[in-house]
């Protein structure tokens, strides 16, 4: 999603962390989330 | 030329915060990471973490977790770090880099030393 | 975290001579896509740190040919010949192969 950083070998040694680290505060969210629909 | 001027000096007393700038200037802001590295007085060199300045995604080395927190303003191609509940184990110099195709730091700030004291 | 260890810590050298410093892993720091990313910096006293090597034996833009680095798997070595004035600091390898990213501990370079 960020073609440009792509020259950057910042991008490409830390890709699949960057990704992990996204999906896990997705995942979060969707949890805190979840707690508060639950509690109305 | 790539440039990456960073914020004064900063005294500050413990359990205090502090928030630092980097700005960028000679190249495109949202093409390259950001990154900070602690560097305490007569030692080594910490990395402490890494901002995308597209999306703000960040990866921190787990060491300062909690301690440093980065951001970027990307209309004034500026990087920010936080750092919180400050100690004198946090008194150091800290500097932003940025990296190229090549080499994770190509290019530094000249640093902003924090002391921490009552 | 992979350990970097320098040595010497200090290096004293005549201006002129030829100056070598070491740099070992702790473990091996080749990358999964097969490159090794162990970097040099030179950080000159009062200044920031300036990117001398890179992919271990890579000079970066405007490094002069007189700085040359070599080694593989967990041994590194940076070399300088002909050492000049410009050329005193501390020498800091660094690994970006595995994190968290390493420095090592840097290595003095002074004048005997």
């Known amino acids: 999603d960020n073609p440009s950083l792509s020259i950057d070998l910042t991008f490409h040694l830390l890709r699949t962390l960057l990704e992990l680290a996204r999906t896990q505060s997705q995942r979060e969210r969707a949890e805190q989330n979840r707690i508060i629909f639950d509690s109305v | 030329e790539v440039q990456l001027q960073q914020s004064g000096p900063e005294l500050v007393k413990p359990g205090a915060s502090v928030k630092m700038s980097c700005k960028a200037s000679g190249y495109t802001f949202t093409d390259y990471f950001m990154k900070w590295v602690k560097q305490s007085h007569g030692e080594s060199l910490e990395w402490i973490g890494v901002?995308?300045?597209?999306?703000?995604?960040?990866f921190y080395n787990q060491k300062f977790k909690g301690k440093a927190t980065l951001t970027v303003d990307k209309s004034s191609s500026t990087a920010f770090m936080q750092l919180n509940s400050l100690t004198s184990e946090d008194s150091a110099v800290y500097s932003c880099?940025?990296?190229?195709?090549?080499?994770?730091?190509?290019?530094w700030g000249q640093g902003t030393l924090v002391a921490v004291s009552a | 975290d992979v350990l970097m260890t320098q040595t010497p810590l200090s290096l004293p050298v005549s201006l002129g001579d030829q100056a070598s410093i070491s740099c070992r892993s702790g473990?091996?720091?080749?990358?999964?896509?097969?490159?090794?990313?162990l970097e040099w910096y030179l950080q000159r006293p009062g200044q920031s740190p300036r990117l001398l090597i890179y992919?271990?034996?890579n000079r970066f833009s405007g490094v002069p040919d007189r700085f040359s680095g070599s080694g593989s798997g967990t041994d590194f070595t940076l070399k300088i010949s002909r050492v000049g004035a410009e050329d005193l600091g501390i020498y800091y390898c660094?690994?970006?192969?595995?994190?968290?990213?390493?420095f090592g501990g840097g290595t003095k370079l002074e004048v005997k």
């Open positions: 660094f690994q970006g192969s595995h994190i968290p990213w390493t």
């Open positions: 992919k271990v034996s």
């Open positions: 901002i995308n300045p597209n999306n703000g995604d960040i």
């Open positions: 880099a940025r990296g190229t195709d090549r080499a994770l730091f190509a290019y």
């Open positions: 473990q091996s720091i080749v990358h999964s896509d097969g490159n090794t990313y």
